[in-house]
Interface confidence: low
């Protein structure tokens, strides 16, 4: 969490941002909140990016003002106009690209004063893994697949029964470049699995950590997966 204040004491307002990560090709949110004002027409929101000449986005007098917008963000940004009056200056960024990563500044002017806060935005690709029993294999084998990751993640297997065991000798992980030549498909195979056990396939890079669990018993197979973004801290 980053909390910023205006420069001159009495005329400063609190602006709060949260560091976040964007998934390439999908829409992202750059979070920013501020002390609300009574009149929408008195609120100015400017989003800036370090190293970028033009503005990322500007909202003033109740509407978008995009004449100074940088080419890089043309047609890809929007604020939540109906929530500005309650202090939400968050920015929706469409079709996130690798090059969107960097330091952003959320700059706010209201009738109460000015304030700004920085936000670190990471970009990459992350997706939920799915673990399945590979019936085509000669021995009992699990196959963990996740369609989109970048940068290249690490993959670690774990099991409930053999806690702390190192499965690197009995697993094989491959990374296959996707058609857009940036993200990669992750496939990891675990051999010699035993029945009545829960196995976890953990995929992690510096942006996200995802886990796919599979519980294999004689009568059923249960799956569960979850994903968590790393380093989401507020300013």
């Amino acid at each position: 969490l980053i909390i910023g204040f205006g420069i001159s004491g009495r005329h400063s307002i609190t602006v709060t941002t949260v560091a976040s990560a964007g998934n390439i090709g999908e829409d992202g949110i750059l979070s920013c909140t501020f002390e609300p004002d009574i009149k929408l027409s008195d609120i100015v929101i400017q989003w800036l990016k370090e190293g970028v000449l033009g503005l990322v986005h500007e909202f003033k007098e109740g509407k978008d003002e995009l004449s100074e917008q940088d080419e890089m963000f043309r047609g890809r940004t929007a604020v939540f106009a109906d929530q500005v009056i309650v202090g939400n200056a968050s920015l929706r960024l469409k079709n996130v690209q690798l090059t969107d990563a960097g330091t952003y500044k959320c700059y706010i002017i209201t009738s109460k004063g000015k304030g700004n806060a920085n936000l670190e935005y990471k970009t990459g690709a992350f997706s939920m893994p799915e673990v399945n029993v590979d019936y085509n294999a000669s021995s009992e084998t699990l196959r963990c697949e996740a369609p989109r990751w970048f940068p290249q993640p690490t993959v670690v297997w774990a099991s409930q029964v053999d806690q702390g065991a190192n499965f690197s000798e009995v697993s094989n992980t491959s990374f296959e470049l996707n058609s857009e030549n940036v993200t990669m498909k992750v496939v990891s195979v675990l051999y010699n699995v035993t029945i009545n056990n829960t196995y976890s396939c953990m995929i992690e890079n510096d942006i996200a950590k995802a886990t796919g669990d599979i519980k294999v018993t004689e009568s059923e197979i249960k799956r569960r997966s979850h994903l968590q973004l790393l380093n989401s801290k507020a300013s």
């Epitope: 469409k94 079709n95 690209q97």
Partner: antibody, heavy 119, light 112 residues
Framework: QVQLQQPGAELVKPGASVKLSCKAS????????MHWVKQRPGQGLEWIGE????????YYNQKFKGKATLTVDKSSSTAYMQLSSLTSEDSAVYYC????????????WGAGTTVTVSS | DVLMTQTPLSLPVSLGGQASISCRSS???????????LEWYLQKPGQSPKLLIY???NRFSGVPDRFSGSGSGTDFTLKISRVEAEDLGVYYC?????????FGGGTKLEIK
């Protein structure tokens, strides 16, 4: 097959408004931005602006701000451009054309609507 | 705005001959994502424009290999080898790197 259908002609009086339509078929309407291009008789092409049908996000050539208003109706896969306060300078052929954001080329164009402003 | 200047305005050419159209931009048209969105379109009389070349040198599907695009920075060229009757019309260059996006003034390809 992918098509953008536009009415052939519109005759309007000076000072009036006209709403041009562009009906898309043969593809997923919300997956492509819709652009509008102006061509005055015997002259070149001018880009007016674009709209993202998925959320109605618009981007205009500053020259046409206040003159053109772009909208879409997702239910009928139709894009519209309203031209206001018409003068003889607005007499032209208006084309709609689709452009996928990250391929960035106009691969399909409508046949164009001829707008004639005359009293 | 980026001004796109095409030369020549009119290009008389013999069938089977070669044609070359130049397009010069008033500033470098490299988009901030690194791509150069320079396209070529052909408009035949009474028709809407048709895409020939995108991103400087990529031929659109179905476009004969007689058409080729080249160039970088501010200078771009469309070449047509072995001109056929169906190639006649007005050729426009277009830049989609800097808004407002702009077209060249057009080059009319006609029979000599």
């Amino acid at each position: 097959q992918v098509q953008l259908q536009q009415p052939g002609a519109e005759l309007v009086k000076p000072g009036a408004s006209v709403k041009l339509s562009c009906k898309a078929s043969g593809y997923t309407f919300i997956s492509y931005w819709m652009h509008w291009v102006k061509q005055r008789p015997g002259q070149g092409l001018e880009w007016i602006g674009e709209i993202d049908p998925s959320d109605s996000y618009t981007y205009y050539n500053q020259k046409f701000k206040g003159k053109a208003t772009l909208t879409v109706d997702k239910s009928s896969s139709t894009a519209y451009m309203q031209l206001s306060s018409l003068t003889s300078e607005d007499s032209a052929v208006y084309y709609c054309a689709r452009r996928k954001t990250w391929d960035w080329y106009f691969d399909v164009w409508g046949a164009g609507t001829t707008v004639t402003v005359s009293s | 705005d980026v001004l796109m200047t095409q030369t020549p305005l009119s290009l008389p050419v013999s069938l089977g001959g070669q044609a070359s159209i130049s397009c010069r931009s008033s500033q470098i048209i490299v988009h901030s994502n690194g791509n150069t969105y320079l396209e070529w379109y052909l408009q035949k009389p009474g028709q809407s424009p048709k895409l020939l070349i995108y991103k400087v040198s990529n031929r659109f599907s179905g476009v004969p290999d007689r058409f080729s695009g080249s160039g970088s920075g501010t200078d771009f060229t469309l070449k047509i080898s072995r001109v056929e009757a169906e190639d006649l019309g007005v050729y426009y260059c277009f830049q989609g790197s800097h808004v407002p996006w702009t077209f060249g003034g057009g080059t009319k390809l006609e029979i000599k």
